[in-house]
């Protein structure tokens, strides 16, 4: 999916008002210095591509993020403010329902959500030069 035509300001507002808080809640009890940010993004569409990938694609050691509150809200924001995104999710939703797993917070998941926090922060500051 190409995130170029999304309404970035509305997605940013949703992140600031609610998604960011859910990410913090998920990470509660973890030191902010515990994980190094290894995933980066260069512009807003690229950031959303990386955010979608880390949020919804199961990875080794962390298969359960998609049912977390921040993930549900991310999915809603993308469906509402990214043209045509919802139709790409019809089949994906059916597949996710089939493979729904018990939510388990592993260290790998905490690391992944830490990466997500970094990507979202970068999304909110699109004019900053890459380090």
């Amino acid at each position: 999916y190409d995130f170029t035509n999304c309404d970035f300001e509305k997605i940013k507002a949703a992140y600031l008002s609610t998604i960011s808080k859910d990410l913090i809640t998920y990470m509660s009890g973890t030191k902010s210095t515990e994980f190094n940010n290894t995933v980066s993004c260069s512009n807003r569409p690229h950031c959303l591509t990386e955010i979608q990938s880390l949020t919804f694609n199961p990875t080794a050691g962390c298969a359960s993020l998609a049912k977390e509150m921040f993930a549900m809200k991310t999915k809603a924001a993308l469906a509402i403010w990214c043209p045509g995104y919802s139709e790409t999710q019809i089949n994906a939703t059916q597949a996710m329902k089939k493979r729904r797993k018990r939510k388990v917070t592993t260290n790998k998941c905490l690391e992944q959500v830490s990466q997500l926090q970094g990507l979202w922060r970068r999304f909110n500051r699109p004019l900053l030069k890459q380090q």
Epitope: N5, D7, K10, A13, A14, S17, T18, M72, K73, K75, A76, A77, A79, I80, W81, P83, G84, S86, E87, Q89, I90, T93, K97
Partner: antibody, heavy 120, light 107 residues
Framework: QVQLVQSGAEVKKPGASVKVSCKAS????????MHWVRQAPGQGLEWMGT????????DYAQKFQGRVTMTADTSTSTAYMELRSLRSDDTAVYYC?????????????WGQGTLVTVSS | EIVLTQSPGTLSLSPGERATLSCRAS??????VHWYQQKPGQAPRLLIY???QSISGIPDRFSGSGSGTDFTLTISRLEPEDFAVYYC?????????FGQGTKVEIK
């Protein structure tokens, strides 16, 4: 089963405001956005805007920006649409309709409609 | 905003005949079109979603097709209860918009 029950008909004077409610039951309220669509007598359907309880935010059609407010009370699973500075051409049936925001993504259930008549 | 144009405005047919309703978008919207039926004094009812997906409880004489800018709703054999107004709607991008409707009336 899924039900959306709207408040009763209203008669308002030009310049007044109206607040229509839509009580939802039979599903998880926050899994769906609530859209508002109106239909003037003998006319087609017009999308006014939506309130997304999951994100606690709204999005309105340009035409209604500044004159409409959509809200919801998640504790009672009730959505509200307030339209201000009413004019005679706001006379219409106002519908609420739910739409999934994390699945389905379509207006699959509608309220029965609320007739709002604006007349001096 | 995306404009949807439905044609014809009115379709006069007899029960048992085939009805073909058209909906054209002002820009490509992939498959993000849904079809609704509305009878006098009633709320719209969803018939087809995402261009061709059927809804449980809707008779299989209703079918949809198309993608991009051109979409079609077909009623294979009209039943007396099918005479109504039909609307297409796009949810590709906000603001969501409806076509102006096609009235299917008894000839």
């Amino acid at each position: 089963q899924v039900q959306l029950v709207q408040s009763g008909a209203e008669v308002k004077k030009p310049g007044a405001s109206v607040k229509v409610s839509c009580k939802a039951s039979g599903y998880i309220f926050t899994d769906y956005a609530m859209h508002w669509v109106r239909q003037a007598p003998g006319q087609g359907l017009e999308w006014m805007g939506t309130f997304i309880p999951l994100l606690d935010t709204s999005d309105y059609a340009q035409k209604f920006q500044g004159r409409v407010t959509m809200t919801a009370d998640t504790s009672t699973s009730t959505a509200y649409m307030e339209l201000r500075s009413l004019r005679s051409d706001d006379t219409a049936v106002y519908y609420c309709a739910r739409m999934g925001v994390t699945h389905s993504y379509v207006m699959d259930a509608w309220g029965q409609g609320t007739l709002v008549t604006v007349s001096s | 905003e995306i404009v949807l144009t439905q044609s014809p405005g009115t379709l006069s047919l007899s029960p048992g005949e085939r009805a073909t309703l058209s909906c054209r978008a002002s820009q490509p919207i992939s498959i993000s079109v849904h079809w609704y039926q509305q009878k006098p004094g009633q709320a719209p009812r969803l018939l087809i979603y995402f261009a061709s997906q059927s809804i449980s409880g809707i008779p299989d004489r209703f079918s949809g097709s198309g993608s991009g800018t051109d979409f079609t709703l077909t009623i294979s054999r009209l039943e007396p209860e099918d005479f109504a107004v039909y609307y297409c709607q796009q949810t590709f991008s906000l603001p969501y918009t409806f076509g102006q409707g096609t009235k299917v009336e008894i000839k």
